[in-house]
């Protein structure tokens, strides 16, 4: 073509794959009549006529562009639809009159690659490798032109480094003309890289400018031998009997070595291997004082047959022994004195408390409880609590029952019971004393007796309500070696007026009368006589 050397640089038109390229013929009126133009594509320096414009009308030439070309802008612009990477070439328009002139357009095609896909080497990398080993592979599919890849470790770009870092990239052309880039990062890693985050970045260009896409971050398994083995105990802090205790063997190697946990036997001076669970954890549940001792962990690196031992760890399971109280079963006369002594052993300093069983009232802080001028009411339960103040929940208790010699003592002297004639009545009578009393009734019926505790007895009587019984009432008599005592139960027929509640009346029907310590079954009415009640 004459004068080609002086030709100006072609106009650059940038477009994304799949979109429409607008090729505007830049010939001025003086250079040619735009109503008479030929369009060519240039590929490998060969021109091919692809479109003619005559009297402003366009006509495609047969070939690869036949279906994708059309005229726009009153014939000054050729529109190329569905642009592909193969369309990246020079297009030129040539005016026919008055003089044959041409205008060149360089079409540049772009396509953003897909999100980069990163795959870590699943086999991992040993730290002692002599040359860089494959860390991860990054694949960027369907980009145009070929994107650039940059590898990052912990947010810093990686550069090629002899015998340390090697980046091996290759690309394939898809049938679409798009490129798929594959980049392999090879590196020599160190132990500190076990938590390193690697990712790849694809840099590419679009008509709008430069862009980049990042892969997800990955960590590569790094293998290094164990150098240190140690034991960890959970929970941390003071341990006590009954706790769930886990003794865990840990190592700084990857993969973890084979572990065993041993406990020193003081008598044989040998370490006896303990049975661990599948995770190599020794679980003591519940922990006992016998679990106290010196534990150590042994780890084997099966690759080298080297065995490593942890520093021993002393485990102390704190305990409180069974509490002993003396005397164990005290008996005393009224008016006498009693000294109760509490003893226990522990791995820590103990604190003692004496409490009244019935009320939980603290009577004494210390191992000795002294009781003087004992009354009948002093009989009953006394509890010694031995506890370790520095370890919440570590305590043991022992209950002792004090018996005061005396004749039977009735729970009530007199009581009124509301009844209906011909009903079967369930009556109860309670007495205490030492020695333990027995109870008898002055009427025939089915009686049963049960021990409440060593000094207390409860007798129940099932009896049919008869007119005679309504007249005489019912007596229960408690007796022991030291005397006897009686309680009277008055029976009253229920009528409508008696069911009107007042301050001293308990309403409701009952088939039983209970002692003051138990509630009545609700089928009859019970009215207490005015207090005070004789307890003689």
């Amino acid at each position: 073509v004459p004068g080609e050397a002086e030709q100006p640089a072609p106009e650059l038109v940038e477009v994304e794959v799949g979109s429409t390229a607008l090729l505007k013929c830049g010939l001025s009126q003086s250079q040619g009549n735009l109503s008479h133009v030929d369009w060519f594509s240039v590929h490998k320096e060969k021109r091919t006529l692809i479109f003619r414009v005559r009297q402003g009308q366009g006509q495609s030439e047969p070939g690869e562009y036949e279906q994708r070309l059309s005229l726009q802008d009153r014939g000054a612009t050729l529109a190329l639809t569905q642009v592909t990477p193969q369309d990246e070439r020079i297009f030129l328009c040539q005016g026919k009159r008055p003089r044959s002139q041409e205008y060149r357009i360089q079409l540049r095609v772009y396509k953003a690659p897909e999100e980069p896909n990163i795959q870590v080497n699943p086999l991992g990398i040993p730290v002692n490798s002599k040359e860089p080993e494959e860390v991860a592979t990054c694949v960027g599919r369907n980009g145009y032109p070929i994107p650039q890849v940059i590898w990052y470790k912990n947010g810093r770009p990686l550069k090629e480094e002899k015998n340390r870092v090697h980046i091996q990239s290759s690309q394939t052309v898809e049938s679409s003309g798009l490129y798929t880039l594959q980049s392999i990062l090879k590196a020599q890693l160190v132990k500190e890289d076990k938590d390193a985050q690697f990712y790849c970045e694809l840099n590419y260009r679009l008509p709008s400018g430069n862009h980049m896409k990042e892969s997800r971050e990955v960590t590569v398994p790094v293998f290094y031998p164990t150098e240190k083995v140690w034991l960890e105990v959970e929970p941390v802090g003071m341990l006590k009997e009954g706790d769930r205790v886990e003794i865990r063997c840990l190592a700084d190697g990857n993969p973890p070595p084979h572990f065993s946990i041993s406990k020193g036997n003081p008598s044989t001076r040998e370490a006896e291997e303990e049975t661990t669970n599948d995770n190599g954890v020794l679980v003591l549940e519940p922990a006992r004082k016998e679990h106290s001792g010196r534990y150590e962990c042994q780890a084997w690196n099966l690759d080298t047959m080297i065995s490593l031992l942890s520093e021993p760890q002393e485990l102390l399971v704190n305990y409180v022994s069974d509490v002993r109280v003396s005397p164990a079963a005290p008996e005393r006369q009224e008016g006498s004195s009693l000294t109760l002594t509490c003893e226990a052993e522990s791995s820590q300093d103990l604190e003692f408390q004496w409490l009244r069983e019935e009320t939980d009232q603290v009577l004494e802080r210390g191992p000795v409880l002294q009781l003087h001028d004992l009354k009948r009411e002093a009989g009953g339960g006394y509890r010694c609590v031995a506890s370790v103040p520095s370890i919440p929940g570590l305590n043991r208790t022992q209950l002792v029952k004090l018996a005061i010699f005396g004749p039977p003592w009735m729970a009530f002297k007199e009581r009124k019971v509301w009844v209906k004639e011909n009903m079967v009545l369930n009556l109860s009578c309670e007495a205490s004393g030492h020695p333990r009393p027995t109870i008898s009734w002055n009427v025939n019926g089915t009686a049963s007796e049960g021990d409440q505790d060593p000094q207390r007895v409860l007798s129940t009587l099932n009896v049919l309500v008869t007119p005679e019984l309504l007249e005489t009432g019912v007596e229960c008599t408690a007796s022991n070696d030291l005397g006897k005592n009686t309680s009277i139960l008055f029976l009253e027929l229920v009528n409508l007026t008696t069911l009107t509640p007042d301050s001293n009346t308990t309403t409701g029907l009952s088939t039983s009368t209970a002692s003051p310590h138990t509630r009545a079954n609700s089928t009859s009415t019970e009215r207490k006589l005015p207090e005070p009640e004789s307890r003689g």
Partner: antibody, heavy 120, light 112 residues
Framework: EVQLVESGGGLVQPGGSLRLSCAAS????????MSWVRQAPGKRLEWVAT????????YYPDSVKGRFTISRDNAKNSLYLQMNSLRAEDTAVYYC?????????????WGQGTMVTVSS | DIVMTQSPDSLAVSLGERATINCKSS????????????LAWYQQKPGQPPKLLIY???TRESGVPDRFSGSGSGTDFTLTISSLQAEDVAVYYC????????FGQGTKVEIK
């Protein structure tokens, strides 16, 4: 017949470096754990380094950790000991050893040794 | 670290007599699960490299004469040469592999 031949010993100044080699023959080198053991003049034997059959695991006592590196080239049936920052107390005969197939760490085969002298 | 102490440092025994070498460990070398001790004995003749004699405290290496025997458990071990021969003149070392690897200081056996 199992043969282990050490080389590379000699005189070196304190702070200097030396690389020992061990040429193995008569067995499948890549299947065995290998070690270096040394013996200072008139002193007890001292284990120096151990490497797994594939070369991925290495172990050292504290006395040489960080200064000595054991490595192997299974393709060449060779074991190496790179010794840096050498001290007078590293003076010893260095033996190349091979483990056996027992479930315990034993040095079943030994080379004749190579003498390393660290002196100014 | 586990310290290995041998006694005596040297021993002179008549040909045909029994030689006994003791080795004491600063801690037990017994693996209670497999009931084996991580202890080996080596023999080093003058001008030669050491040679493995015994492993697992009492298992004789193949090719080792049966006059050599190992015994003991836990922390105390013994190498016995039941009938000393002229070729047994050497330094004998015990070695533990319970925690890394350490040798005893050696016991020199001579003929009286």
């Amino acid at each position: 017949e199992v043969q282990l031949v050490e080389s590379g010993g000699g005189l070196v100044q304190p702070g200097g470096s030396l690389r020992l080699s061990c040429a193995a023959s008569g067995f499948t080198f890549s299947s065995y754990i290998m070690s270096w053991v040394r013996q200072a003049p008139g002193k007890r034997l001292e284990w120096v380094a151990t490497i797994s059959s594939g070369g991925s695991s290495t172990y050292y006592p504290d006395s040489v950790k960080g200064r000595f590196t054991i490595s192997r080239d299974n393709a060449k049936n060779s074991l190496y000991l790179q010794m840096n920052s050498l001290r007078a107390e590293d003076t010893a005969v260095y033996y190349c050893t091979r483990d056996d197939d027992y479930d315990v760490k034993v040095f079943a085969y030994w080379g004749q040794g190579t003498m390393v002298t660290v002196s100014s | 670290d586990i310290v290995m102490t041998q006694s005596p440092d040297s021993l002179a025994v008549s040909l045909g007599e029994r030689a006994t070498i003791n080795c004491k460990s600063s801690r037990s070398l017994l693996n209670s699960r497999i009931r084996k001790n991580y202890l080996a004995w080596y023999q080093q003749k003058p001008g030669q490299p050491p040679k493995l004699l015994i492993y697992w405290a009492s298992t004789r290496e193949s090719g080792v004469p049966d006059r050599f025997s190992g015994s003991g458990s836990g922390t105390d071990f013994t190498l016995t040469i039941s009938s000393l021969q002229a070729e047994d003149v050497a330094v004998y070392y015990c070695k533990q592999s319970y925690n890394l690897l350490t040798f005893g200081q050696g016991t020199k056996v001579e003929i009286k």
